[in-house]
Interface confidence: low
């Protein structure tokens, strides 16, 4: 199979000896060999002078346009040109591929198999971590994010490894050792998952990571409108300020004795200062 140069490599002014590269013929430069080399001396072995630059512009020669395929180098002869072909190619213009598996064209431990048709003399089956027609390109297998939960992916060549963050395990860090399914929250607390973290939502009167610590239920100031909070063995009690009622003192009492349903979330009415 003919070598595949870098995509966009100039077929006239560039060639390659390895797949994916682009080497420039004399007088051309740039990553794709599309930029002519500017010569400050403006000396040229042959050709008319340019009216705009005063430099000599090369005239057509037998090697112009690079008549040698597959990275062959062209040299002028008195009558025409001659191609010097890279290994594995022959013919007047190096157009015939002679590379076979015997030439060992597969890099990085690729397995060479004879091609099924004349256009492909060989096919390389690449090992994990390599790709390209000659297994010349290394694949970044870690870019596929095989490690989860923030695990660090290490490509060791023969295999991938995940280095897990604390609290995670498994070959791909897929197991959260703090997963709610395997976590007990004490004193009636419930486990809550979210944002990759797992915590206990504790019952009233308890706190801490596993709800094992006694907490002050009044610390959250659960009584609205200046109500006074009292901790009680069964929960908490709000003693409401005059003019307010409800378990958390969230409803104002109207002068006529009727209570109004809240027009805003309980404990906070429009215009009321947040206590």
């Amino acid at each position: 199979a003919p070598l595949v140069c870098r995509a966009g490599c100039s077929p006239e002014h560039g060639f390659c000896e390895q797949p994916g590269e682009c080497r420039c013929l004399e007088g051309w430069t740039g990553p794709l060999c599309t930029v002519p080399v500017s010569t400050s001396s403006c000396l040229s072995p042959r050709g008319p002078s340019s009216a705009t630059t005063g430099c000599l512009v090369p005239g057509p020669g037998p090697c112009d346009g690079n008549p040698c395929a597959n990275g062959g180098s062209c040299s002028e002869t008195p009558r025409s040109f001659e191609c010097t072909c890279p290994r594995g190619f022959y013919g007047l213009r190096c157009e015939v591929s002679g590379v076979t598996c015997a030439d060992g064209p597969c890099f990085n431990g690729g397995l060479c198999v004879g091609g099924a048709d004349p256009d492909s003399a060989y096919i390389c089956h690449c090992p994990p971590g390599f790709q390209g027609s000659n297994c010349e390109k290394r694949v970044d297998r870690c870019s596929l994010q095989p490690c989860r939960n923030g695990g660090l992916c290490l490509d060791l060549g023969h295999a991938l490894r995940c280095r897990c963050r604390a609290g995670f395990a498994g070959p791909r860090c897929e197991h959260d050792l703090d997963d709610c399914a395997g976590r007990a929250c004490a004193n009636g607390g419930t486990c809550v998952e979210g944002g990759g973290a797992h915590r206990c939502s504790c019952a009233l009167g308890f706190g801490g990571r596993d709800c094992r610590e006694r907490a002050d239920p009044c610390a959250a100031r659960p009584c609205a409108h200046g109500g006074r909070c009292y901790a009680h063995f069964s929960g908490l009690v709000c003693a409401c300020a005059p003019g307010y009622m409800g378990a958390r003192c969230e409803f104002p009492v109207h002068p006529d004795g009727a209570s109004a349903l809240p027009a805003a979330p309980p404990g906070l009415r429009p215009g009321d200062p947040q206590r």
Partner: antibody, heavy 124, light 113 residues
Amino acid sequence: QEQLVESGGGLVQPGGSLKLSCKVSGFDFSNYGVSWVRQAPGKGLEWIGYIDPAFGRTYYASWVNGRFTISSHNAQNTLYLQLNSLTAADTATYFCVRVALVVAGVAYYGMDVWGPGTLVTVSS
Amino acid sequence: DVVMTQTPASVEAAVGGTVTINCQASQNIYSYLSWYQQKPGQPPKLLIYRTSTLASGVPSRFKGSGSGTQFTLTISDLECADAATYYCQSYYYSSGSSYGAFAFGGGTEVVVK
């Protein structure tokens, strides 16, 4: 197209050996593993073992007891199940199955692509 | 290894009805539970993975729930095409022994009248 195709099944005598192949195409091993699962005629599914080719890990069901071996030839996208010391109880259809492991950071561990299966008959 | 106990072994329901299949794991398997549908002469087909996520192309009539050791597959608005055997499958990883294992339930045959 993502597919797995098993081959190598057939008739084998008790005490004999067989090597099953599974040709994989259409997906990369980096985020997938492959399990071998079998199903005896008229019975349920039974997990045999699993290989995570990218990580070089193999796991087996405890009942396998070293009689079966899973291997992979990553360059040829082929997996193998070597069956040794076969008995009539090993008569089953053997499935090669893709296991979705961790894709784009999310763990699944579901068997999402199944081969058609290859029948192994152990009989004298 | 984890043992998966699937109940009932067989269930019958009418078209348009609802079927519930239960699966119990002998150890905590977190949310690593999948459900499969198998019809005679065919390989199984993935329906649900990670307890409740529908596989591509599976209708929302299939619903998975549960966590830890208890899991349920519910099929509502039953159709004739739902007649099949259903299997649950777990994945368990032991961080202590760095060993992973899969296991299948015994299967539930769903008969649609």
